[in-house]
């Protein structure tokens, strides 16, 4: 167990300067998993600081992180994925602060990709499709996706749609005619695994058709 004071008033008396956060990515490189940690305060002097993970590992007691500029990183097959690991910031042999973390609760999926939008003239709708590497994975297979779209001129007026599949239909009548739209998508674990939103996919831009005055319908692109 970590050797911190048990008194409830003291337990958060670890050096706040060294508070950090981490996320895991499972099967990020074949069967290899990764763990990435960084200090919350970007001004921390990281010169002599190291990260170490102990517990809930296969065949080894502890692993050291590699330092990549301001982040700390491990890529390994040795995560047991059950039980809590102790992640510590260290100077030499001295632990400055530690966190007990279950790596299955800090999973950050990879960003979706190949986002595209196809207009269907007959159906008067737009079919949004995208891909995710998680369809091929064995652990984090079930995701919730957040599709966000906005009219390009509306800086912060994003409309969000949550879905579990990789296909979404947007009705033409719900969108402004003859307008440029930006759309993007991100993912979060669903079913057993917990964690954080992925990075956003690259944005895709599409234009809605003009309204055809005679029929009251939009022109195809």
């Amino acid at each position: 167990e970590s050797g911190y004071a048990q008194n409830g008033d003291l337990e958060d008396a670890e050096l706040d300067d060294y508070s950090f956060s981490c996320y895991s990515q499972l099967e990020v490189n074949g069967s290899q998993h990764s763990l990435t940690c960084a200090f919350e305060d970007p001004d921390v002097n990281i010169t002599n600081l190291e990260f170490e993970i102990c517990g809930a590992l296969v065949e080894v007691k502890c692993l050291n992180f590699r330092k990549l500029q301001e982040i700390y990183f491990i890529e390994t097959k040795k995560f047991l994925l059950i039980g809590k690991s102790n992640i510590c910031v260290k100077v030499g042999e001295k632990s400055l602060t530690c966190k007990k973390i279950d790596l299955t609760t800090i999973v950050k999926p990879e960003a979706p990709f190949d986002l595209s939008v196809v207009y269907r003239e007959g159906a008067n709708d737009f079919v949004v499709t995208f891909n995710t590497s998680h369809l091929q994975k064995k652990y984090v297979k079930v995701l919730m996706h957040d599709v966000a779209y906005r009219q390009e001129k509306d800086e912060n007026k994003w409309t969000h749609v949550n879905l579990s599949s990789t296909k979404l239909t947007l009705l033409q009548r719900k969108l402004q005619p003859a307008a440029m739209y930006e759309i993007k998508v991100r993912s979060i674990p669903d079913h057993y695994f917990k964690g954080f939103w992925s990075e956003w996919s690259p944005s895709y831009y599409f234009r809605t058709p003009e309204i055809n005055n005679s029929s009251g319908e939009m022109d195809p692109i």
Epitope: Q6, I82, K84
Partner: antibody
Framework: QVQLVQSGAEVKKPGASVKVSCKAS????????LHWVRQAPGQGLEWMGG????????AYNQKFKGRVTMTSDRSTSTVYMELSSLRSEDTAVYYC???????????WGQGTTVTVSS | DIVLTQSPASLAVSPGQRATITCRTS??????????MHWYQQKPGQPPKLLIY???NLESGVPARFSGSGSETDFTLTINPVEAEDTANYYC?????????FGGGTKVEIK
């Protein structure tokens, strides 16, 4: 050493409430979730729910939703389980248990016997 | 809810012999190589004690004569060789889905 110490036995009338405490020691209280599991006389084990002392977040077995409340007090490293609208079927030994991982229980309290009888 | 069915309900074994308890689940409790099945021992008047977590990982301090195996819906707890002090009830438990459920228990007696 790591220990969970529970409050003493209770005898309650049907319709009443009971509040059982579980004091943790020997580890950092906010590092592990604490759960409640009960065992009726001569019966098996039944998970009731759990609490994360760091956030106060709870997860309850749907069977007990609306009747059970779990709380924690970081200043005393204690969690509480309150069960209301007691009936005779709630007569059981109630255990608090630490979750070593999702969600298995590596440390158990000694148990608190709750008897519901008119 | 996921139903866990243990067999046999009771078992009498001679010291030095092997005891095998099985636990079958109503749906898979595995995600690839992550098997969310755990085993406990409970002696009369005592709380349960964790023996095995994640189907096959021996809890610290538990004798190596206890072992676990299995995946998906079929899991086994083996005690080999059985000792007199192993007289107890044994329970399996799944943790893939809330509510986290236990098997009905297997009573092991030493002849």
């Amino acid at each position: 050493q790591v220990q969970l110490v529970q409050s003493g036995a209770e005898v309650k009338k049907p319709g009443a409430s009971v509040k059982v405490s579980c004091k943790a020691s020997g580890y950092r209280f906010t590092d592990y979730e604490l759960h409640w599991v009960r065992q009726a006389p001569g019966q098996g084990l039944e998970w009731m729910g759990g609490i994360d002392p760091k956030t106060g977040g709870t997860a309850y077995n749907q069977k007990f939703k609306g009747r059970v409340t779990m709380t924690s007090d970081r200043s005393t490293s204690t969690v509480y389980m309150e069960l209301s609208s007691l009936r005779s079927e709630d007569t059981a030994v109630y255990y608090c248990a630490r979750s070593g991982g999702r969600w298995y229980f590596d440390v158990w309290g000694q148990g608190t016997t709750v008897t519901v009888s008119s | 809810d996921i139903v866990l069915t243990q067999s046999p309900a009771s078992l009498a074994v001679s010291p030095g012999q092997r005891a095998t308890i099985t636990c079958r689940t109503s749906e898979s409790v595995s995600i690839h190589l992550l098997h969310l099945m755990h085993w406990y021992q409970q002696k009369p008047g005592q709380p349960p004690k964790l023996l095995i977590y994640g189907a096959s990982n021996l809890e610290s301090g538990v004798p190596a004569r206890f072992s676990g195996s299995g995946s998906e819906t079929d899991f086994t707890l083996t005690i080999n060789p059985v000792e007199a002090e192993d007289t107890a009830n044994y329970y399996c438990q799944q943790s893939i889905k809330d509510p986290y459920t236990f098997g009905g228990g297997t009573k092991v007696e030493i002849k």
